[in-house]
């Protein structure tokens, strides 16, 4: 055996999306000869990582390498073995990682030096483990969704690849609902992006791109609703909580300490006569809503326009593919119908919310009651959040469209962010003309 | 034809340091992943440890028994592996095989000749 | 850290016969493990990698079987250049570890 394997003619990569809730492996694959072309790789196949976190690893780092041992033995299953020593791996940490770093910068670095040495000891090319920040977040998630949906190609198709597809070559704005944090990023019309933070400028495929984004840390919707239980905590008069974002009926107890535990609680911090709590649902869409928008500062704005807490917003432009959270909740409240208007959204959100607690366990018996109990909360958030917080109105409500998947892959940064770091998207157009997406489809 | 060859055997004293040398030929040394296995005398073989690629930021992995004291390097330049030993214990007598795989991963087609590591006072 | 033992610790058969040689893993290791022969003075040689699979140069009579945590290297017929010691190799994961061998001797 003394000739290296002949290499299959296909490339693979492994993204690892370590986020603020749970971590998730992908594996890409894209045949060799065709790597500068747009729109020629594609996602094989996503690991769910059992478990929390990473950042909550951070009292028991050493059983991060079992955390991670199940899906790094799948890709060892699916990646042929002569192609795993050529097969690079990325772990890119979100913002529960972030939040980390805030609290201690030596604590996110344990964690994530042990993640590395546990990646590392499996035989693919382990390229390193980073925080990724919330601009690249943003900008990788809005590459995505442009190279799947063949945006960069100098090709105008007669046909459509997917239902939203618009034949045009205006690329797709991105929106993107984390645990937490949320991205929003597109191209603004003819506008000045007036923040510099908020800019950036791309040459993809021989085209030049200004692309507006930010990323609002602490706005995901598992922190978004740790900050509205400290918000709303602070005027309860005893340790109940009378809670409109939850079902009637609906109870649980919630430390004081786990609600402090997060910097997003910070401004909202006061010492209380008790160390639990326990929440008491209500069930009210309208009051629900009314409380989340008191977590959007709209009062300050040193721009011509704001999205909220005093952060530029440009006017929205074009069609935006919302996705992760965005999508996951309302596929399961089944509002990511392209038919249903705002108002509808809103109609049915007031219903579902208002549902017995006891109704909905019966109704929904195989989802785990953590998150059952939370989709009147996040379906309510997104609403708000696009509302009031984007500045979506009834008739831009049907530029958004709810993406789980595209072509066969996710939504999401992990694609973008394996295209920057392995130079599969040339700023010029390749000289050779590529295929037609007809090819891969 | 390919080849392996260790040099920079000898004897020491406990506490004492060593490099060994496996100079490589035959192959493109710089695209695979090299191997140091020992085998003390009468017994078995024991993986001492493996050095990456330029790519893997020549990423190295030792055996809980050599580690802290035991340093893989390469130079792809010269088409050698190196090991340096430090704080050398009676134990790590041994004959030391210089390994690599030219087929996948994590099993050795091709072994040095060897070379013979004494600790002894 | 994956743990390997071999049996017999010494395995006597006379030359024609057939030899059965035995190798248990403390884990599951689907099919990532290796055989080598080594003789006297000479560095081990590479038979079987990844359970089964046959090296060109090795005699046909030497095969493998076995996934999970239990394997075999088979010699259908043996030859008197195959009295020597025979390790098996954990290849799935690090620290890669050795069995500790079977000697195969002429009876």
């Known amino acids: 055996t003394q000739n290296k394997a002949l290499p299959e003619n296909v490339k693979y990569g492994i993204v690892l999306d370590a986020g603020s809730s749970h971590t998730s492996l992908y594996i890409y694959k894209w045949p060799a000869e065709k790597e500068n072309d747009t729109g020629v790789v594609h996602q094989v196949e996503e690991c769910r990582v059992k478990g929390p976190g990473i950042s909550k690893f951070v009292q028991k780092v050493n059983e991060i390498g079992i955390y991670l041992t199940d899906c790094m033995e799948r890709a060892r299953e699916v990646i042929p073995r002569s192609q795993h020593q050529e097969t690079p791996v990325y772990l890119g940490a979100t913002a529960g990682m972030r939040l980390l770093r805030m609290e201690s910068e030596e604590l996110a670095d344990r964690v994530l030096d042990v993640v590395e040495r546990s990646l590392s000891n499996y035989p693919f090319d382990f390229q390193g483990a980073r925080i990724i920040t919330g601009q690249e977040e943003g900008a990788y998630g809005w590459i995505t969704i442009n190279y799947l949906l063949g945006k960069f190609s100098q090709k105008t198709r007669w046909f459509s690849i997917v239902p939203y597809e618009t034949n045009n070559q205006e690329t797709f704005g991105a929106l993107d609902l984390g645990g937490a944090s949320t991205q929003v990023t597109f191209v603004p019309q003819n506008q000045t992006i007036e923040s510099p933070d908020n800019a950036l400028q791309f040459r993809l495929y021989g085209k030049d791109y200004n692309v507006y984004t930010h990323s609002f840390l602490c706005y995901g919707k598992d922190q978004a609703l740790w900050q509205k239980l400290a918000k709303d905590i602070q005027v309860a008069s005893n340790e109940i909580l009378r809670d409109p974002c939850f079902h009637p009926g609906y109870k649980k107890v919630v430390n004081v300490s786990d609600l402090y535990k997060t910097p997003c609680t910070k401004r909202f911090e006061m010492t209380l006569p008790f160390q639990q709590f326990e929440i008491q649902g209500i069930g009210n869409y309208q009051q629900c809503h009314q409380s989340i928008l008191e977590l959007f500062n709209t009062s300050y704005c040193p721009y011509s326009q704001c999205a909220f807490n005093g952060i530029f917003l440009p006017p929205l432009q074009g069609d935006f593919g919302a996705f992760s959270a965005f999508y996951f909740v309302m596929k399961f409240l089944n509002l990511t119908s392209e038919k249903v208007s705002q108002e509808k959204v809103t109609e049915m959100m007031k219903k579902f919310c208002a549902q017995p607690w006891e109704e909905i366990k019966t109704s929904y018996a195989g989802v785990k009651e953590k998150y059952l109990s939370e989709y009147c909360f996040s379906g309510t958030y997104i609403l708000s959040l696009l509302l009031q917080g984007y500045h979506f109105t009834a008739d831009s409500w049907e530029h958004i469209h709810f993406i789980g998947k595209i072509q066969g892959s996710d939504a999401g940064w992990t694609l973008g962010y394996m295209l920057n770091l392995t130079n599969m998207i040339p700023a010029e157009q390749p000289l050779s003309t590529p295929l037609s997406h007809s090819t891969y489809v | 034809e390919v080849q392996l060859v260790e040099s920079g055997g000898g004897l020491v004293k406990p506490g004492g340091s060593l490099r060994l040398s496996c100079a490589a030929s035959g192959f493109t040394f710089s695209k695979y992943w090299m191997n140091w296995v020992r085998q003390a005398p009468g017994k078995g073989l024991e993986w001492v440890g493996e050095?990456?690629?330029?790519?893997?930021?020549?990423?190295?992995h030792y055996a809980e028994s050599v580690k802290g004291r035991f340093t893989i390097s390469r130079d792809d330049s010269k088409n050698t592996l190196y090991l340096q030993m430090n704080s050398l214990k009676t134990e790590d007598t041994a004959v030391y095989y210089c390994t690599t795989q030219l087929d996948l991963y994590w099993f050795f087609d091709v072994w040095g000749q060897g070379t013979t590591v004494t600790v002894s006072s | 850290e994956i743990v390997l033992t071999q049996s017999p610790a010494t395995l006597s058969v006379s030359p024609g016969e057939r030899a059965t040689l035995s190798c248990r893993a403390s884990q599951s290791i689907s099919d990532y493990l290796h055989w080598y022969q080594q003789k006297p003075g000479q560095s081990p040689r590479l038979l079987i990698y990844y359970a089964s699979q046959s090296i060109s140069g090795i005699p046909a009579r030497f095969s493998g079987s076995g996934s999970g945590t239990d394997f075999t290297l088979t010699i259908s017929s043996v030859e008197p250049e195959d009295f020597a010691v025979y390790f098996c190799?954990?290849?799935?994961?690090?620290?890669?570890?050795f069995g500790g061998g079977t000697k195969l001797e002429i009876k």
């Open positions: 050095i990456r690629l330029k790519s893997n930021k020549y990423g190295t």
């Open positions: 190799q954990n290849g799935h994961s690090l620290p890669l570890t």
